[in-house]
């Protein structure tokens, strides 16, 4: 399978888009990432605090026979019905031996606000 | 504006070497993964090679894997493609593109393309 | 590999019609495709990708939508412009793979 080469750069292939809408609405926000080895567990941030009880889910694909080969993984945070508490910036975070990475941000906002 | 300006095409015999190079400008090129993918003559389109922003992390198609390294000089704002051992089958139109932010594996911006024959 | 799909080569359609060009992944890629539209002499132009965000500046006549291994690129009322080639791409893991394409003609 394909290996990226390592390094000490992020891991993160994509990052949080930006949501904009009304009261209800429904909408995603993911973050992708390839990884050498086993996959962490994704984390989301909002306003740089650790969402507990996110609707996340986490999707990982091994590229290889080998538990060392690379992964895909693609973390989805769904917003069922966006109210104002849902309003800020979203990160995803990953410890990953040592280091812990976080994604660039996207935000989430109201119209009208 | 974004603009890629891909150069460095040529024709070239079997095994020879090529280097192509894209300038980027209209952007922090360093906050974007760019690719290589090039364009056959029936159309079809196959990714070369990508790298992250800041060159750490690189992948390759496996068939250009040992003959061809995509590296970047963030400093220039310049994508390269160092092509060797190259095969007729390589002939193509090469694009260099720019990683969306929310996936560097979809390309948002392309360059015009830089031809590359490989004939004898 | 991840093997992309498009079972027609091409599609015939008149000014202001409704046309949906599909795409197939040989396995679940979550909604990790793009689209991309390419007129002769012209490099691609993304107008989608995760399955449904439109690229910035592109018109909402467009729309993508899909999930698991299926998906599919609208063009509502479409416009003499929108003639061109059309591409899907799996953005989920490398190798990255295109589609063959789709050709969009008139009538």
């Known amino acids: 399978a394909p290996r990226g080469t390592q390094a000490e750069e992020s891991p993160f292939v994509g990052n949080p888009g930006n949501i904009t809408g009304a009261r209800g609405l429904t909408g995603t926000l993911r973050c992708q990432l390839q990884v050498q080895g086993e996959p962490p567990e994704v984390h989301w941030l909002r306003d740089g605090q650790i969402l507990e009880l996110a609707d996340s889910t986490q999707t990982q694909v091994p590229l290889g026979e080998d538990e060392q080969d690379d992964w895909i993984v693609v973390s989805q945070l769904r917003i069922t019905s966006l109210q104002l508490s849902d309003t800020g910036q979203y990160q995803c975070l990953v410890f990953l031996g040592h280091q812990t990475f976080v994604s660039q941000p996207g935000y989430v906002g109201l119209e009208g606000l | 504006e974004v603009n890629l300006v891909e150069s460095g095409g040529g024709v070239v015999k079997p095994g020879a070497s090529l280097k192509l190079s894209c300038e980027a400008s209209g952007f922090t090129f360093s906050n974007y993964g760019m690719s290589w993918v090039r364009q056959t003559s029936d159309k079809r389109l196959e990714w070369v090679a990508s790298?992250?922003?800041?060159?750490?992390?690189?992948y390759y198609l496996d068939n250009v894997k040992g003959r061809f390294i995509i590296s970047r000089e963030n400093a220039k704002n310049t994508l390269y493609l160092q092509m060797s051992s190259l095969k007729s089958e390589d002939t193509a139109l090469f694009y260099c593109?720019?990683?969306?932010?929310?996936?560097?594996?979809?390309?948002?911006?392309w360059g015009q393309g830089s031809s590359v024959t490989v004939s004898s | 590999v991840i093997v992309m799909t498009q079972s027609h080569k091409f599609m015939s359609t008149s000014v202001g019609d409704r046309v949906s060009i599909t795409c197939k992944a040989s396995?679940?890629?979550?909604?990790?495709v793009a689209w991309y539209q390419q007129k002769p002499g012209q490099s691609p132009k993304l107008l989608i990708y995760w399955a449904s965000t439109r690229h910035t500046g592109v018109p909402d006549r467009f729309t993508g939508s899909g999930s698991g291994t299926d998906y599919s690129l609208t063009i509502s009322n479409v416009q003499t412009e929108d003639l061109a080639f059309y591409y899907c791409q799996q953005h989920f893991t490398t190798p990255l793979t295109f589609g063959a394409g789709t050709k969009l003609e008139l009538k």
């Open positions: 593109a720019r990683g969306a932010r929310a996936s560097y594996f979809a390309m948002d911006y």
């Open positions: 396995q679940d890629v979550t909604t990790a």
């Open positions: 790298i992250s922003g800041g060159g750490g992390r690189t």
